[in-house]
């Protein structure tokens, strides 16, 4: 490439270029000037830049740096944003299916328990969804509430269907008996373990993806220091003052400037690496009871087994509960 | 035992679900995401170099700009002058990160700690001889990681059933489910394919 022509004797070309950034010709000298007031593009000889032009170039440098950062992170940002949205939607679908499977199980196997069972199942899976999205709900409480609500219905509809209406106010007693007598065996505890482990992992996975987006957004919109702005201006725009629009910065010089400007950003590197490796470790462990898809879509089966367990022990239970809750109107069993 | 939906009998007919070997599951999608993320593991350390390589710098040109003047690209002067008068470059590095960067580093530290805490402990052994408290011995113990339930024939094999792209969308109207005595999930005709989860490359 031929050497660039000597600087424009009239600053005409500099004006044309600067005009695109700042319409109006007021800031560009007609002919080269000493430029003694310049603070960034310190001239070795006459210059076509003014102090105002320097300021505009500094603003342009910062904007350009922001653009370069944003285009550098575009692919990464898109990857995480898309996946966060896709996984969130997929988890919601899993929850919806799990609810439908459970409702179908009740409808097919225990029609007498509907529609109350549908209501309790619906509330449980609503809480599951809210938990995944970060709500401050206790998983054990969710599971306990499901079984506490189900047992009175199971008792009055399946185990004691002939119970007179007058006896239907023993629900509180039955809820208490459910826990103390472990009427569902260890199934509630099992479900608590599985659901809490799988949901915790799912929740932290989504939180981690959303934080990933926040990290990139933060570095995308960093406001660079004045010193950095001056360094960038020197590298990218000071040549314009000499009428040298097409010259490029020396490669090593660019690296020095960028490392200086991004010293703070580069400090994220250690934690970013750790973030990706920790996320990988989490994902590698997301199987069996740590996989909410696996756990939630199998819940209907475990709930079914827990009801069968109650039915299997119905004789003993009915006798015990009959004694415990016989006078529940006077003395609520706790 | 209550079987996973794929194995259920509905109206004495087996619910058939087509198996497509390469279908994408949530877990395969998670692994794919991690692989892609790992290609960005050096993103922040590589950023200065990336920006220089993606903005005009002298490559084939004989002359380049060193901040003050045009110099020969390979001359010592180019390197030397590029380094000096760089507005307290050392001081710039000494200042430390901006408050927003410090904040985001703190958030990363916190999530990393959570992720490590959450990561599944290695080498969990499956204990098949766990007694259940209550009225009768059962299948699963207090903290049995792998037991998904299922009485009678031991542990139930749970398949990763929810396909990611060709998903079994059981958008069920429960009133349509037949009230037979076998445990069941929706009927064949209630299986629709879910399409609007885009495949991100």
């Amino acid at each position: 490439q031929p050497p660039p022509p000597p600087p424009d004797a009239t600053c005409h070309q500099v004006r044309s270029f600067f005009q695109r950034l700042q319409p109006g010709l007021k800031w560009v000298p007609e002919t080269p000037v000493p430029g003694s007031d310049l603070q960034v593009c310190l001239p070795k000889g006459p210059t076509c830049c003014s102090r105002k032009m320097e300021e505009k170039y500094q603003l342009t440098a910062r904007l350009n740096m922001e653009q370069l950062l944003q285009s550098a992170s575009m692919e990464l940002k898109f990857l995480i944003i898309q996946n966060a949205a896709v996984f969130q939607e997929a988890f919601e679908i899993v929850v919806r299916h799990a609810k439908n499977y459970t409702n179908a199980m009740f409808k097919n196997n225990y029609p007498s328990l509907t529609p109350q069972a549908f209501e309790f199942v619906g509330e449980f899976f609503t809480d599951v969804s809210l938990y995944i999205l970060g709500s401050d709900i206790n998983v054990d409480d969710m599971v306990n509430e499901l079984f506490d609500s189900l047992f009175p219905v199971i008792y009055t509809q399946l185990m004691n269907p002939g119970l007179p209406d007058s006896a239907l106010d023993i629900n509180e007693c039955l809820r208490g008996a459910r826990r103390d007598l472990k009427v569902f065996g260890n199934f509630p505890k099992l479900i608590m373990t599985q659901v809490s482990k799988s949901l915790q992992v799912t929740r932290i996975f989504l939180q981690a993806l959303n934080l990933g987006i926040e990290v990139i957004n933060t570095t995308d919109h960093l406001k660079f220091s004045k010193d950095c702005g001056r360094m960038l201006t020197r590298m990218w725009y000071c040549s314009y003052c000499q009428g040298l629009m097409m010259v490029k910065p020396c490669g090593g010089y660019c690296n020095v400037v960028m490392q200086g400007c991004m010293a703070g950003v580069v400090e994220i590197d250690k934690y970013w690496r750790e973030y990706i490796l920790s996320l990988e470790e989490l994902v590698n462990g997301m199987y069996r009871i740590y996989d909410m898809e696996n756990v939630l879509l199998g819940l209907f089966s475990t709930i079914h087994d827990s009801i069968q367990y109650v039915q299997k022990n119905a004789g003993k239970l009915t006798t015990t509960i009959g004694k415990l809750c016989a006078h529940s109107q006077q003395r609520q069993y706790r | 035992s209550a079987y996973y939906p794929e194995d259920l009998f509905i109206d004495k007919k087996v619910l058939k679900v087509a198996h497509v070997e390469h279908e994408e599951t949530l877990s395969s999608r998670r692994r794919e995401l991690i692989q892609k993320l790992k290609s960005f593991i050096s993103f922040y350390s590589a950023l200065p170099g990336y920006i220089c390589s993606h903005s005009p710098v002298a490559e084939n040109d004989t002359l380049c700009w060193n901040g003050q003047e045009l110099v020969e690209r390979y001359s010592q002067k180019a390197a030397r002058n590029g380094m000096k008068n760089q507005f307290n470059l050392h001081e710039l590095k000494m200042k430390g990160p901006e408050p927003v960067v410090s904040q985001i580093i703190d958030k990363l530290k916190h999530i990393n700690q959570l992720l490590r805490t959450m990561s599944v402990p290695k080498g969990r052994v499956l204990d098949k001889n766990l007694d259940e408290e209550g009225f009768e011995s059962g299948d699963c113990g207090d903290d049995e990681d792998e037991c998904i339930g299922g009485s009678g024939d031991g542990m139930m094999k749970v398949k990763n059933q929810l396909r990611f792209l060709a998903e079994l969308a059981y958008d069920l109207d429960v009133d349509d489910v037949p009230g037979n005595n076998q445990q069941a999930t929706p009927k064949d005709n209630e299986i629709s394919t879910f399409h609007n989860l885009g495949n991100v490359h």
């Epitope: 070309q13 270029f17 695109r20 950034l21 904007l63 575009m74 725009y237 629009m245 | 005009p56």
Partner: antibody, heavy 118, light 105 residues
């Protein structure tokens, strides 16, 4: 790959105004510079003006000063050219074109063009 | 005001021949800011050459540009039938900001 899609053909009465749009896809719109060039039937190319969306600053050729307004909407990646006080000699194909830039400064070469609006 | 004059107005040649198109500026133009465009009927212009002599991506190497100061040339070494078009030169950086030549057909 950057593409510029222009709005459809317009028929206007003398004295009225016309607003032509140019939607960009691919790349980072805010860091482009967009120029508008027109071509009367059987004639050559004539630069009307240009804008750098990130600055919102527009420049106009002397001939069109006061009659043309070039704007850009970063949120929709769309540039607009409005020409007022239309006369019969304004009958032409109006092109939008992306200008090559170095560090946000347009270098004057138009490397991507819309298909034109008549 | 800088004007660009292109010659000849029309050039009739056969495939395989060499075409030489001229562009003359009324004032000296920096070679960094002179471009050549090709326009086929019913199509938008296409950038061929920038900075007087640099080819853009995808432009065949039979197209070459040269010149400095006030005289610039576009050469098509071996003409192909698809090279039939109008060619415009354009300068940037002098008032008015952008100027096109009238074109060579």
């Amino acid at each position: 790959e950057v593409q510029l899609v222009q709005s459809g053909a317009e028929v206007k009465k003398p004295g009225s105004s016309v607003k032509v749009s140019c939607k960009a896809s691919g790349g980072t719109f805010s860091s482009y510079a967009i120029s508008w060039v027109r071509q009367a039937p059987g004639q050559g190319l004539e630069w009307m003006g240009g804008i750098i969306p990130i600055f919102g600053t527009a420049n106009y050729a002397q001939k069109f000063q006061g009659r043309v307004t070039i704007t850009a909407d970063k949120s929709t990646s769309t540039a607009y050219m409005e020409l007022s006080s239309l006369r019969s000699e304004d009958t032409a194909v109006y092109y939008c074109a992306r200008e090559w830039q170095q560090q946000l400064v347009p270098l004057g070469y138009m490397d991507v063009w819309g298909k034109g609006t008549t | 005001e800088t004007t660009l004059t292109q010659s000849p107005g029309t050039l009739s040649l056969s495939p395989g021949e060499r075409a030489t198109l001229s562009c003359r500026a009324s004032h000296s133009v920096s070679s960094n800011f002179l471009a050549w465009y090709q326009q086929k009927p019913g199509q938008a212009p296409r950038l061929l050459i920038y900075a007087a002599s640099s080819r853009t991506t995808g432009v065949p190497d039979r197209f070459s540009g040269s010149g400095s100061g006030t005289d610039f040339t576009l050469t098509i070494s071996r003409l192909e039938p698809e090279d039939s078009a109008v060619y415009y030169c354009q300068q940037y950086g002098y008032s008015p900001l952008y100027t096109f030549g009238q074109g060579t057909k």
